[in-house]
Structure formats: C-alpha cells, structure tokens
Amino acid sequence: HTAAQDNCTCPTNKMTVCSPDGPGGRCQCRALGSGMAVDCSTLTSKCLLLKARMSAPKNARTLVRPSEHALVDNDGLYDPDCDPEGRFKARQCNQTSVCWCVNSVGVRRTDKGDLSLRCDELVRTHHILIDLRHRPTAGAFNHSDLDAELRRLFRERYRLHPKFVAAVHYEQPTIQIELRQNTSQKAAGDVDIGDAAYYFERDIKGESLFQGRGGLDLRVRGEPLQVERTLIYYLDEIPPKFSMKRLT
C-alpha cells in the first residue's frame, strides 16, 4: 500500500494531494509544492516537506558537548531545490541569486556566495544530536525507561531502526538523543536520520506531519514527558567550510 486505499490519504504526510489515479486505480499521493509522488508507507524526505511547507498558506555532564563542527539550523525556512529522489540539491540559491551549499538535512554548511559558487557533492549528515529540555516533573525520569521509550518512539512512529539511535543521555531536565547513520550503514528502505529528526522536531512543536494520527503523546511509565525547548545539532561526514569571520 502506497497510501490508505479506503479514503485515499497519505498516513505519513498530510501535506499531500491524493487521488485514485495510480496503476489499477490505486491511491497515489503527491507532495504539495513539488508535485512529486511520495511513498506513504514511510517518511517523506525533509526537502519535499520543506518545499510543501513553503507552498502552503503562511501561518504563523553525561551530556554530549556538540563538537566545534556541529551545525545548528539558524537560517530557518527556505524554499529548497530537491533532486528527483526528493533529496536536497547540494547547492541552494534564492531568488536574488545568493547561493550556498547544504548538507543532506538541508542546513547551510558554507558561507553564502553568488551563482559561481560550486558545491561538488551533497555531504551527508551522519550524526544528529537532539537536545531537549523537559518541563519540571515530580522527580527525574528513570534513565533506562526514558531510553526504552524514546527508542520505541523512533522505531514505531518514525520507523527508524533502534541501531540508528546511538544513545539517549539524561541529566534532568536535559535529554539528548544521538542519531548516527553513516552512508555505509544506511540500507535501501532505511529511514534517513535527518527525516526522522525533522518529523520528531515537528511533533515536539505540535505540528505533526502525520495524517489523522494524534499528536505526540510521550509518556514514560505513564508520566507525561512535555518538552519546553529543542535544539538540534548536525554533524557532517566532512566538516563545514565557513570563513573565520563567521566563527568569531
């Protein structure tokens, strides 16, 4: 099943238009913005989701220290160029011919330049650090229960295999989820850690991308886990290239 046949919708992406015009009258869904056909049995790529979002009407100590090469998405939303597989193109440009290179999660990894800027390859983000702060609770969560529930969430909601959840760190009230996935580790059909992290980020913000599924109800031993702050760091297989001016 590419999509839910009964009412022809896309369970994994509500930013789609679906109709029974696939082979044999099967339900087929296309992403808003790009019009690309999407596989509704898995997560839609972040690039297509960002494109769809831009086309939609506007609404409003045990902890890991991110390395000096970690990127944070400070640029916010933009209308990306996606390749035929739905991945980010290595070079992105805006309407004023300002260009920059991005990694596989679409985060800028070079200084901005003009149309002459070259981005030879799409550099893979192989390590994502999701930094969360939860709202105060009666006591700290049990670390192993928290670890198990977060791995279960990524497995069952985002279909990310537990082997890609490298670690869950906890030092109340900070939770850090480390996702790791090298090019060599990612097999055909595996969900990309960048896509899983993006779905999780949108879920945490109360902006679920799933069709008809309830919002994220995270509980650890019945106790609600309510997140009040999220920060995501991205580490690429090749360190980013920024001028010293940006680093000071």
Epitope: H1, P11, S41, S144, D147, A148, E149, R151, R152, R155, E156, R159, L160, H161, P162, K163, V165, V191
Partner: antibody, heavy 120, light 110 residues
Framework: QEQLKESGGGLVQPGGSLKLSCKAS????????VSWVRQAPGKGLEWIAY????????YYATWVNGRFTISSHNAQNTLYLQLNTLTAADTATYFC?????????????WGPGTLVTVSS | DVVMTQTASPVSAAVGGTVTIKCQAS??????LSWYQQKPGQPPKLLIY???KLASGVSSRFSGSGYGTEFTLTISGVECADAATYYC????????????FGGGSEVVVK
C-alpha cells in the same frame, strides 16, 4: 544455521520461581530484538515481553505487572526470563522468538519451546 | 491498547478449495500485521508480514490483504498439510499492549 533453543522449564510449586534461558546461535544477537511468548495447553499465543539486547531496552505485556523479568547476556548470546510468584495459570510452553531485524515486530525465528508446569 | 480479534474456529476447507480467515484490529495498525501458522507440538511459523508480504520459503498459495483495521489471510488450493491454527499479530507496537496476537483460527481440511 540460525537457531534458538529454550531451557529451564520443569515442574514448580505455586508461589515458586524459575529462570528460563534461550540460547541463540548462527546470528549476531545484537542486531535483533527477541520476545518471550507463551502458550497454555490447548490455548492461543500470549506475548510476555520483548528486549532489544544491543541497548537492553525492555517492554512487557500490561498483565505482567512486574512478576516476570526479561534480560540478556549478550556475550553469551543468551536471553532469560525470570518467572516469580508462579500460579497454575502460568502453566504453558514458553517460546523465545526473534524479530526479523526490521522496524516491525514480526517474529521469523522461534525456538521449540520449554514446558513450565506449576502444580503442587 | 490494540486488541486483535480473529474469525471464530474451526474453519472448514475442502482439499483444493479456498479458505479465508479474517482479523480485526481495535484501532489502525496501518499495514503492520503478521500471520503465523502453528501445527500441534510445533512453534509458530511466520507466513505473512506487513499484511501482504510472503515470508521466506512460504508457498504462494498463502496470501494476505488489508490495511488499517481489517485484514484477511487466504489459502488457495488447500492441501491436507494446511490443517493448523492460524494467528494474526499486530506488528506495530510493544507499548501498552496486553497481547499482540489474535485468539487463533483453526483450519480443518476435509
């Protein structure tokens, strides 16, 4: 050849305890999740617990209520199920079952089972 | 808690005929449904996963269909060796679950 083999079953008195083992061979234990499933004589399959050994993540059926504990010894490729406060209702064949290594919980490799009889 | 309900037993089938077993989930499990075959004195054997995909080494006489809450296992060209109990299982979640297996449906071949 990929195999699972349960052991440790037998006759136990009501209120007693027992520790079941499941030895895995022929595959990398850390790449899969494993469950314990039981079947009372003439009855259906009843899931007990699941563990992802690589990270020691454990999940239990709601009815377990702390009576049973799933664990693993990864270096020995062995899965365990500790059974406490046993009653006649726990009399069953206990199977260990491995998942397919995907994100689904479908079990494509099963052991032959070990029989636990709770009786005075 | 996802509860799985199966066709009542026993289900009779004639050799060469077709038999259908139904399974219902109390809430949507998308396509995350597996079917198992169990014969007396043996452990269960995985037949179908993700509602319609045939497990390795399983005869193509077995087929599965369904999505969401309604699922079906079909055995065509029934053989005497198909006499067994068949179980469906939701393969979506291990969280807050009483039992992911259905109650089982016994197939009797005449």
């Amino acid at each position: 050849q990929e195999q699972l083999k349960e052991s440790g079953g037998g006759l136990v008195q009501p209120g007693g305890s027992l520790k079941l083992s499941c030895k895995a061979s022929g595959f990398d234990f850390n790449k899969y999740g494993v469950s314990w499933v039981r079947q009372a004589p003439g009855k259906g399959l009843e899931w007990i617990a699941y563990i992802y050994p690589a990270f020691h993540n454990t999940y239990y059926a709601t009815w377990v209520n702390g009576r049973f504990t799933i664990s693993s010894h990864n270096a020995q490729n062995t899965l365990y199920l500790q059974l406490n406060t046993l009653t006649a209702a726990d009399t069953a064949t206990y199977f260990c079952a491995r998942d397919a290594g995907t994100t689904d919980y479908n079990f494509n490799l099963w052991g032959p089972g070990t029989l636990v009889t709770v009786s005075s | 808690d996802v509860v799985m309900t199966q066709t009542a037993s026993p289900v009779s089938a004639a050799v060469g005929g077709t038999v259908t077993i139904k399974c219902q989930a109390s809430q949507s499990i998308y396509s995350y449904l597996s079917w198992y075959q169990q014969k007396p004195g043996q452990p269960p054997k995985l037949l179908i996963y993700e509602a319609s995909k045939l497990a390795s080494g399983v005869s193509s006489r077995f087929s599965g269909s369904g999505y969401g809450t309604e699922f079906t296992l079909t055995i065509s060209g029934v053989e005497c060796a198909d006499a067994a109990t068949y179980y469906c299982q939701q393969a979506l979640t291990v969280g807050n679950v009483d039992n992911p297996f259905g109650g089982g449906s016994e197939v009797v071949v005449k």
